[in-house]
């Protein structure tokens, strides 16, 4: 590693990042007919343009606007599933409940899911050694700003009843510092969204607690109510049903159409 290269606290860009983004784009546009018009090379160029040659602690939402424009996508606004600290289960749910969508079921979310990336000021190189950590280095890094941007847009698009899946096994079931708590909650549009329904997923097999009475859920209810959106919370006790559906996604038990 050249001595002058900035050393950040977080992991570096995911290996084969350009190839991965391009391959994901091609795959997504093949599977989703409504996105077949998307030119994946242009998408990659716009993605690259958002962070290449820029200081990785000085990225803005504006930097991602060309990518946002190319990735514009309409999902049914009343079928949105948000999540916090329970990504895998939320994705398992939408894998089988095909008429509901998480952010990672959209093109832009799919492209970036689980990836890390950053560049360097005044050089066209991608930094594969290290990238800024949100806490230890800076919050305006390429990855954080990307997710803040797409999460805000996703929440703004939501309407009617919006669901959010929360992890009942965590000490903070609702964490106001999470992307959901800091971005999505505040960008739901009261004139479009009637209700936010929280699904609190229980982990323990003998768990009979009412986690909807948790203080952090009360905090979420307060935030949502102040925004003139109704709030509902449901305890969900049998997540093993979701796992069964991942094994057999075509099975009739994997749809809520009764």
């Amino acid at each position: 590693v050249p001595r002058w290269r900035q050393q950040w606290s977080g992991p570096g860009t995911t290996k084969r990042f350009p190839e991965t983004v391009l391959a994901r784009c091609v795959k997504y546009t093949e599977i989703h007919p409504e996105m077949r018009h998307v030119d994946c090379q242009s998408v990659w160029d716009a993605f690259k343009g958002a962070f290449i040659s820029k200081h990785p602690c000085n990225i803005t939402e504006e930097d991602y606007q060309p990518l946002m424009k190319l990735g514009t996508q309409t999902v049914p606004c009343n079928k949105i599933l948000l999540w916090s600290r329970i990504k895998d289960l939320a994705h398992q749910f939408t894998q089988v409940q095909r008429d509901m969508f998480t952010l990672e079921d959209t093109l832009l979310g799919y492209l970036a899911d689980d990836l890390t990336w950053c560049g360097e000021f005044n050089t066209s190189k991608i930094n594969y050694q290290s990238c800024p950590d949100w806490r230890k280095d800076c919050s305006n890094n390429p990855v954080s700003v990307f997710w803040k941007t797409v999460s805000r847009r996703f929440a703004e698009a939501a309407c009617d009843v919006v669901h959010v899946m929360l992890n009942g096994s965590r000490s903070k079931i609702f964490d106001k510092n999470s992307t959901f708590g800091s971005v999505e909650v505040h960008n739901l549009q009261p004139e479009k969204v009637q209700t936010l329904e929280a699904w609190v997923i229980h982990g323990g097999r003998e768990d009979s607690r009412d986690l909807c009475q948790d203080p952090t859920i009360k905090e979420l209810e307060s935030i949502i109510s102040k925004r003139n959106i109704q709030f509902s919370c449901k305890n969900i006790y049998r997540p093993d049903k979701f796992l069964q559906c991942v094994k057999n996604p075509e099975d009739s038990s994997c749809t809520s159409e009764i």
Epitope: S208, D240, N248, I258
Partner: antibody
Framework: QVQLVESGGGLVQPGGSLRLSCAAS????????MNWVRQAPGKGLEWVSG????????YYADSVKGRFTISRDNSKNTLYLQMNSLRAEDTAVYYC?????????????WGQGTLVTVSS | DIELTQPPSVSVAPGQTARISCSGD??????VYWYQQKPGQAPVLVIY???KRPSGIPERFSGSNSGNTATLTISGTQAEDEADYYC??????????FGGGTKLTVL
Amino acid sequence: QVQLVESGGGLVQPGGSLRLSCAASGFTFSSYYMNWVRQAPGKGLEWVSGINMESTRIYYADSVKGRFTISRDNSKNTLYLQMNSLRAEDTAVYYCARDLPLVYTGFAYWGQGTLVTVSS
Amino acid sequence: DIELTQPPSVSVAPGQTARISCSGDNLRHYYVYWYQQKPGQAPVLVIYGDSKRPSGIPERFSGSNSGNTATLTISGTQAEDEADYYCQTYTGGASLVFGGGTKLTVL
């Protein structure tokens, strides 16, 4: 279409045993939680026991805990309820019921029931 | 364990709206299910997840759940709706409970 057919009911003396069976067809049996629900003559519904897909999560109502055992054989598409130390208050129609999918925990389909009478 | 309380009986004239309540502590935090049972028959699911209707159930059946009370509403009640109705919820582990049932009489 979905079918649940219970069998094994009958007259038994207090302290006796019975084994109920529920034959399932028309759906992938191994993908669902299954349950037993009973109804005493002229009374309401009472959930008895439930079992998950792989028999790793098993639940009983307090009224039958330690006396009844639920089990399933996914290769035979069959649910069982072994009832021991039967009491007069166990007299009821016993229904086999299939759980709803995903976030829902209710009963989408029911069998026609089998009558268990505990009397001397 | 949560306890579900239903009125023992409800009467309604044909064509009118019948409402059957089901109450329990913080019931809004749990999904509620409603079953119809006619004499000598097995129960039939009429509402799941508070307000969703299974296919084949007439549109006149609807459900709601807020506060401590869930309600089954039958609009334009017909003679064939005369039956016993049970609410049910699940509060985790071995806590799957039914209400005591409500006998609906269509006058």
